[in-house]
Amino acid sequence: IWELKKDVYVVELDWYPDAPGEMVVLTCDTPEEDGITWTLDQSSEVLGSGKTLTIQVKEFGDAGQYTCHKGGEVLSHSLLLLHKKEDGIWSTDILKDQKEPKNKTFLRCEAKNYSGRFTCWWLTTISTDLTFSVKSSRGSSDPQGVTCGAATLSAERVRGDNKEYEYSVECQEDSACPAAEESLPIEVMVDAVHKLKYENYTSSFFIRDIIKPDPPKNLQLKPLKNSRQVEVSWEYPDTWSTPHSYFSLTFCVQVQGKSKREKKDRVFTDKTSATVICRKNASISVRAQDRYYSSSWSEWASVPCS
Amino acid sequence: RNLPVATPDPGMFPCLHHSQNLLRAVSNMLQKARQTLEFYPCTSEEIDHEDITKDKTSTVEACLPLELTKNESCLNSRETSFITNGSCLASRKTSFMMALCLSSIYEDLKMYQVEFKTMNAKLLMDPKRQIFLDQNMLAVIDELMQALNFNSETVPQKSSLEEPDFYKTKIKLCILLHAFRIRAVTIDRVMSYLNAS
């Protein structure tokens, strides 16, 4: 058993049928010595008396808010949560496996640049009685500071019969140098509590591996005289690290017909312009990627050919 | 990326072209190592990230873009000094810091070159003959060093009398390639920045 926060405790259980569970001793936080009784949750049934209460925690029915009283007055509370270990592996009931970029990916994180700021998100089908708390650091043995905000519900989607909820959090490394070469990964730890179930999820990454630039901005077309060709130009996104000559991007320019089946013409360039043939009803799209470290491509920025 | 790329003209700065070749070569070598050594811990998540140049060179600090010198987090240690007669210096007006930067890059390349050559000698003794260093990568390191053209004492190749542990050598190769790829990215950024200046 360990303390998650004041008056909230996590009991780790080896979870299998007929498991003996864990013996837990609760102590009433009071100078009083006698006349103390204990109850669980809203029930008025007295579970025991005395300054300490010994319980065998086996299932969720044994978890909850234990309260010690004296003469009708509440003295203190202890909330017991359960953390299930199933055959040596901590349960992952609360969050959905996003399966991207690989199986068992519960937390996904992205950064728009090298400033040390990043966003993580996760999915669940649970809509109520759910709380998250997020901590992060650079490295784990001698951790350096990363400050995370509160996790917020950022999207709701309908997936088949189920509603899916996306939560996200923004974090910022306290003293980040955009040019630094990372040798210790960022660690992100999310504590999830659903009713009386506790779970924790972790992700470990280098900022350089989660970079996904914003799409190029100010995408414009300039027709070339007496030609079906157009000059496409664009700019680096505002959120990208500066100077751009150091943090350079490479670009992919795509001409896509109205039909998804039509052949796509693609050109790759390090410049912020390109000359392409603009077909009728087609659209031109441009996306960006770090020129030197191949992390994710940005989303496409698009303009119609007409 | 294995796709047609319209590359910019390296122009007046001969090292840019060499640094681009270097990054390509080390990235290819790392990919080859990951595939060949699939049963070894060779992915970024599995290896210890060690920098053999740590406390010996200070490339990131010495080559910091002017715009980032206002960022206190970037100014940890900028006290190392180096030889200053590089041939990549495109104009007479090149600052002392730029000379320091290029000389730091040269020292990095020299250290990695020695490590890679020593390692290759060990890998050639492996009866499994599982993996060797790409000669193209070693050649590209050499070319960039020549383009930088710094006078520096030659570091003797490390020789080892004891029987090599091939498992450890292959893991060390992965560690080295990951670190060198990260340094090659920094070198490429620096060359691009200097070329634009």
């Epitope: 979870w15 299998y16 007929d18 969720f60 199933e86 055959d87 | -």
Partner: antibody, heavy 115, light 112 residues
Framework: QVQLVESGGGVVQPGRSLRLSCAAS????????MHWVRQAPGKGLEWVAF????????YYADSVKGRFTISRDNSKNTLYLQMNSLRAEDTAVYYC????????WGQGTMVTVSS | QSVLTQPPSVSGAPGQRVTISCSGS????????VKWYQQLPGTAPKLLIY???QRPSGVPDRFSGSKSGTSASLAITGLQAEDEADYYC????????????FGTGTKVTVLA
């Protein structure tokens, strides 16, 4: 006392269907994940499928994906395996088992796929 | 096809010590715990070892398990006639959990 009893096995022709049941007793069935494991005659153990305690997630071996469906009725304390498009290579003893460090197995039910 | 490899058979005289190996990789045994089962002819598997080296109550201390890196092993000391059975190791893969990975199985023969 934890007990698992499989039923529903038998002889079936290739391409036909069969539904296996596993009746659980002696524990809170709705709190635990459950597996189906099979063993072809004279062969080793092969995992078939898994279902979470609440039925929210199901996992299948590649060899049965798209043909077999695992399900559970927590109100009836019963686990099911719906087997469609059966093949000769599905011939085996099918066991249900609890998920956990200390697991409990049923006695098994024989499925024979033969023309 | 099983990714956990066991020797097809091992044998020993009564009273001897035999060991069964179970070889995996970094993503399965290297990252997860190992179980061992004994299966007597015509019966369901019986749990012998969980969490690499733990014995459930009722299993004789002649059976012991260990794990090192990407391999695990089961040792039977003081071999007895009733130990003649098939033995299976089981683990998980970190990317396909909760799918059970079983070893290929080892037939233990007690020599007369």
């Amino acid at each position: 006392q934890v007990q698992l009893v499989e039923s529903g096995g038998g002889v079936v022709q290739p391409g036909r269907s069969l539904r296996l049941s596993c009746a659980a007793s002696g524990f809170t069935f709705s709190s635990y994940g459950m597996h189906w494991v099979r063993q072809a005659p004279g062969k080793g153990l092969e995992w078939v499928a898994f279902i979470r305690y609440d039925g929210s997630n199901k996992y299948y071996a590649d060899s049965v994906k798209g043909r077999f469906t695992i399900s559970r009725d927590n109100s009836k304390n019963t686990l099911y395996l719906q087997m469609n498009s059966l093949r000769a290579e599905d011939t085996a003893v099918y066991y249900c088992k609890t998920h956990g460090s200390h697991d409990n197995w049923g006695q098994g039910t024989m499925v024979t796929v033969s023309s | 096809q099983s990714v956990l490899t066991q020797p097809p058979s091992v044998s020993g005289a009564p009273g001897q010590r035999v060991t069964i190996s179970c070889s995996g990789s970094r993503s399965n045994i290297g990252s997860n715990t190992v179980k061992w089962y004994q299966q007597l002819p015509g019966t369901a598997p019986k749990l012998l070892i969980y969490y690499n080296d733990q014995r459930p109550s009722g299993v004789p201390d002649r059976f012991s398990g260990s794990k090192s890196g990407t391999s695990a092993s089961l040792a039977i000391t003081g071999l007895q006639a009733e130990d003649e059975a098939d033995y299976y190791c089981q683990s998980y893969d970190r990317y396909t959990h909760p799918a059970l990975l079983f070893g290929t199985g080892t037939k233990v023969t007690v020599l007369a």
